[in-house]
Interface confidence: medium
């Protein structure tokens, strides 16, 4: 099977409807990183829908990486994770949508967008350019698609999977909440 076929299956397979993820990073592919260490780690496999072992090189990589099987399960599966979820059910927002705006500690002051759980809307804020949290989007549209009710083409995860499909095709995992660029 080609990777494209597998990606296609994630979105359209009628026997396994869209997966209800607790965190969008659980959809990232296992990434061993460029370093050469041999470290046993665990990642959530969206195809098998379970946590699996992989070898991590010791640097970089992505957030879909856990030191223990238990930690992986806690972050990426629910107690009822394997139940069938009808696509007509409203998708839950990722947990990070409920984090407060966090400018971080640096002083770059870049315009970003976050989901304000009080107003239930995406709003602009000034991001310092480092640290902070995942409730941090480069565009208003991106924030709305992922965190607002009824945003985008049917709420949250569809958009994450669509983005993932495109970005995997281009050779890299999605990093919608990591694009903390400085603009000088």
């Amino acid at each position: 099977d080609s990777e494209e076929d597998e990606e296609h299956t994630i979105i359209t397979d009628t026997e396994l409807p869209p997966l209800k993820l607790m965190h969008s990073f659980c959809a990232f592919k296992a990434d061993d990183g460029p370093c050469k260490a041999i470290m046993k780690r665990f990642f959530f496999n969206i195809f098998t829908r379970q946590c699996e072992e992989f070898i991590y090189g010791g640097c970089e990589g992505n957030q879909n990486r856990f030191e223990s099987l238990e930690e992986c399960k806690k972050m990426c599966t629910r107690d009822n994770a394997n139940r069938i979820i009808k696509t007509t059910l409203q998708q839950e927002k990722p947990d990070f949508c409920f984090l407060e705006e966090d400018p971080g500690i640096c002083r770059g002051y870049i315009t970003r967008y976050f989901y304000n759980n009080q107003t239930k809307q995406c709003e602009r804020f000034k991001y310092g350019g480092c640290l902070g949290n995942m409730n941090n989007f480069e565009t208003l549209e991106e924030c709305k698609n992922i965190c607002e009710d009824g945003g985008g083409s049917g709420g949250g995860l569809n958009d994450i999977f669509e983005a993932q499909k495109i970005e995997w095709h281009e050779g890299g995992p999605p990093h919608h909440h990591h694009h903390h660029h400085h603009h000088h």
């Epitope: 970089e60 957030q63 500690i105 350019g129 902070g132 903390h180 400085h182 000088h184």
Partner: antibody, heavy 118, light 113 residues
Framework: EVQLVESGGGLVQPGGSLRLSCAAS????????MSWVRQAPGKGLEWVSA????????YYADSVKGRFTISRDNSKNTLYLQMNSLRAEDTAVYYC???????????WGQGTLVTVSS | QSVLTQPPSLSGAPGQRVTISCTGS?????????VQWYQQLPGTAPKLLIF???NRPSGVPDRFSGSRSGTSASLAITGLQAEDEANYYC????????????FGGGTKLTVLG
């Protein structure tokens, strides 16, 4: 004149706890994020933790997450690092530093040595 | 292994120009994050030398200059002096994983006698 003075270091057994303090003077403490950075003997620098000026946001390196807690008391101009479940690899000189321009640490304390050994 | 890579050691004669390199990746320097440089004299705390790629804090001589391009950065020291003998560290932010402030492994600069 900006001054940062660390204290609280010492010898502790593996699994033990220690609380470091950093007394700040010469600048408006509550306006600055603060960090702890450590340096193992003969090794390079490693960022440990940071806290926003208000104390509302905290950040940790993966190597200390769940074991160390950073906090601050702006009324006392003091930064703290509570270190639990200490390991031999936590042995280092611990520096406190204030985050000023860009992502830089403008000023550093003289450091306090933490030795974890049985 | 450090996220940012520096040569472990360099040396130069007094009056010479030396350049210390710092190589990162697409998740730190290549993602347009600023680089800082620190000087650590033997037995002392680090001191900020360059911030925001190429800015000097007041009190730092203009013999020190910094630059960043793509996934690399460099610190240049002209008119090398005996008191420049120290360890030099580059530092930036890395957006991969949970996000972290990262350092190079340090470069020991020796001024030849």
């Amino acid at each position: 004149e900006v001054q940062l003075v660390e204290s609280g270091g010492g010898l502790v057994q593996p699994g033990g706890s220690l609380r470091l303090s950093c007394a700040a003077s010469g600048f408006t403490f509550s306006s600055y994020a603060m960090s702890w950075v450590r340096q193992a003997p003969g090794k390079g620098l490693e960022w440990v933790s940071a806290i926003s000026g208000s104390g509302g946001s905290t950040y940790y390196a993966d190597s200390v997450k769940g074991r160390f807690t950073i906090s601050r008391d702006n009324s006392k101009n003091t930064l703290y690092l509570q270190m639990n479940s200490l390991r031999a690899e936590d042995t280092a000189v611990y520096y406190c530093a204030n985050n000023g321009a860009a992502a830089a640490w403008d000023y550093w304390g003289q450091g306090t040595l933490v030795t974890v050994s049985s | 292994q450090s996220v940012l890579t520096q040569p472990p050691s360099l040396s130069g004669a007094p009056g010479q120009r030396v350049t210390i390199s710092c190589t990162g990746s697409s998740s730190n320097l290549g993602a347009d994050y600023d680089v800082q440089w620190y000087q650590q004299l033997p037995g002392t705390a680090p001191k900020l030398l360059i911030f925001g790629n190429n800015n000097r804090p007041s009190g730092v001589p203009d013999r020190f200059s910094g630059s960043r391009s793509g996934t690399s950065a460099s610190l240049a020291i002209t008119g090398l002096q005996a008191e420049d003998e120290a360890n030099y560290y580059c530092q930036s932010y890395d957006r991969s994983l949970s996000g972290s402030m990262v350092f190079g492994g340090g470069t020991k600069l020796t001024v030849l006698g």
